[in-house]
């Protein structure tokens, strides 16, 4: 139950991608507007996204802080223009979201190949090493400080002129493959965390083939 | 409970050719890489091939390239090895396992296909 | 192609003894190395992964070791339940490949 006219928000969502996370929900508001709070399992409340008309607030912030904490957030729902009313229990009108642990769960972006290079019969495949939001001594992240060596990179690969894949693994930002001299091969990449039960896999990275801008050849 | 059950295995004449089927129960193919493993009689392990079922990359060993192709349907939650122009050397037991990009976690229990006139 | 080389292909030993099984890649593999058990008539089982970690569930007596192209698998002390066949499997670049298989055979 709450004040006349004000609906409690639903379908609390984290949407997360390289620890950039927001918070959506529903519904739209008529009437009405919002505030969200977000805290660790043992923390204090802390308040964003005061009063809004938006369903979404951005809460990267907050859980940039400590990627391995779990954090639980709740939307607080208020009549438009009379923030202070209250729901007959006398408490704001509000709805928890699920719990949200960035580390486990924050989605893998789709990553990109950065160059690669031939030297005889092997290529040297970089991976851009993406910068994140989380920071540590003042300095921002990349993907690999964060996740280490529970982050792979799986490595397809294929003769430009033949459709049979194969494929490699790193822990690296960076793959070691043996080619045919004379041939062209194209690329592409996607990261994986093998110890996660769920968003394992990113998508694909875009493809990369030799004899375009990204690579270099030495005899 | 994670499960992996094979089926289609069976008795085939040279040159013929047979689907096997992988079913998978307790999560979801997408979110893992499929392999197909063999074992001939009394033979070690052989490393057929893999599927991503989310975006359906296949890697095979050149071996079979040309003759066995593995695909999914992630609706039904299964992986499939499609086997032509069988020979008596395919005559194995083929194993199906889910692959957490570090290890082979999760094995079916195996189908046997026999190849013979 | 990488090889995986396995040895030794059987051995014979009694309940409690230290039992110890390598496999040496062809070339450099980094840690993409894991250990399964097979007993007759089963499937494959996972036991040692990914620079030595083992499966929850798998007893602390198998543990492995190895990195690059030379890789062990250890039984601290045998149980009755261990006879078997163990093989190694490269899983860092296709074809993956397995060891020949070890059989540990009861003494």
């Known amino acids: 139950s709450g004040t006349t006219n004000t609906v409690a928000a639903y379908n609390l969502t984290w949407k997360s991608t390289n620890f950039k996370t927001i918070l959506e929900w529903e519904p739209k508001p008529v009437n009405q507007v919002y505030t969200v709070q977000i805290s660790t399992k043992s923390g204090d409340w802390k308040s964003k996204c005061f009063y809004t008309t938006d369903t979404e607030c951005d809460l990267t912030d907050e859980i940039v802080k400590d990627v391995k904490q779990t954090y639980l957030a709740r939307v607080f729902s208020y009549p438009a223009g009379n923030v202070e009313s209250t729901g007959s229990a006398g408490e704001p009108l509000y709805e928890n979201s699920p719990e949200f642990t960035p580390y486990l769960e924050t989605n893998l972006g789709q990553p990109t190949i950065q160059s690669f290079e031939q030297v005889g019969t092997k290529v040297n495949v970089t991976v851009e090493d993406e910068r994140t939001l989380v920071r540590r001594n003042n300095t921002f992240l990349s993907l690999r400080d964060v996740f280490g060596k529970d982050l792979i990179y799986t490595l397809y690969y294929w003769k430009s002129s033949s459709s049979g894949k194969k494929t490699a693994k790193t822990n690296t930002n960076e793959f070691l493959i043996d080619v045919d001299k004379g041939e062209n091969y194209c690329f592409s990449v996607q990261a994986v965390i093998p110890s996660r039960t769920v968003n394992r896999k990113s998508t694909d990275s875009p493809v990369e083939c030799m004899g375009q801008e990204k690579g270099e050849f030495r005899e | 409970e994670v499960q992996l059950v094979e089926s289609g295995g069976g008795l085939v004449q040279p040159g013929g050719s047979l689907r096997l089927s992988c079913a998978a129960s307790g999560f979801n193919i997408k979110d893992y890489y499929m392999h197909w493993v063999r074992q001939a009689p009394g033979k070690g392990l052989e490393w057929v091939g893999w599927?991503?079922?989310?975006?359906?990359?296949?890697i095979y060993d050149p071996k079979f390239q040309d003759r066995f192709t593995i695909s999914a349907d992630t609706s039904k939650n299964t992986a499939y090895l499609q086997m032509n122009s069988l020979r008596a050397e395919d005559t194995a037991v083929y194993y199906c396992a889910r692959d957490t990009a570090a290890y082979f976690d999760y094995w079916g229990q195996g189908t046997l296909v026999t190849v013979s006139s | 192609d990488i090889q995986m080389t396995q040895s030794p292909s059987s051995l014979s030993a009694s309940v409690g003894d230290r039992v110890t099984i390598t496999c040496k890649a062809s070339?450099?593999?980094?840690?993409?190395l894991s250990w399964y058990q097979q007993k007759p008539g089963k499937a494959p089982k996972l036991l040692i992964y990914?620079?030595?970690s083992g499966k929850r569930g798998v007893p602390s007596r198998f543990s492995g070791s190895g990195s690059g192209t030379d890789f062990t698998l250890t039984i601290s002390s045998l149980q009755p339940e261990d006879f078997a066949t163990y093989y190694c499997l490269q899983h860092g670049e296709s074809p993956f490949t397995f060891g020949q298989g070890t059989k540990v055979e009861i003494k």
């Open positions: 070339r450099d593999i980094k840690s993409y």
């Open positions: 599927i991503d079922p989310e975006n359906g990359n296949t």
């Open positions: 990914y620079e030595g």
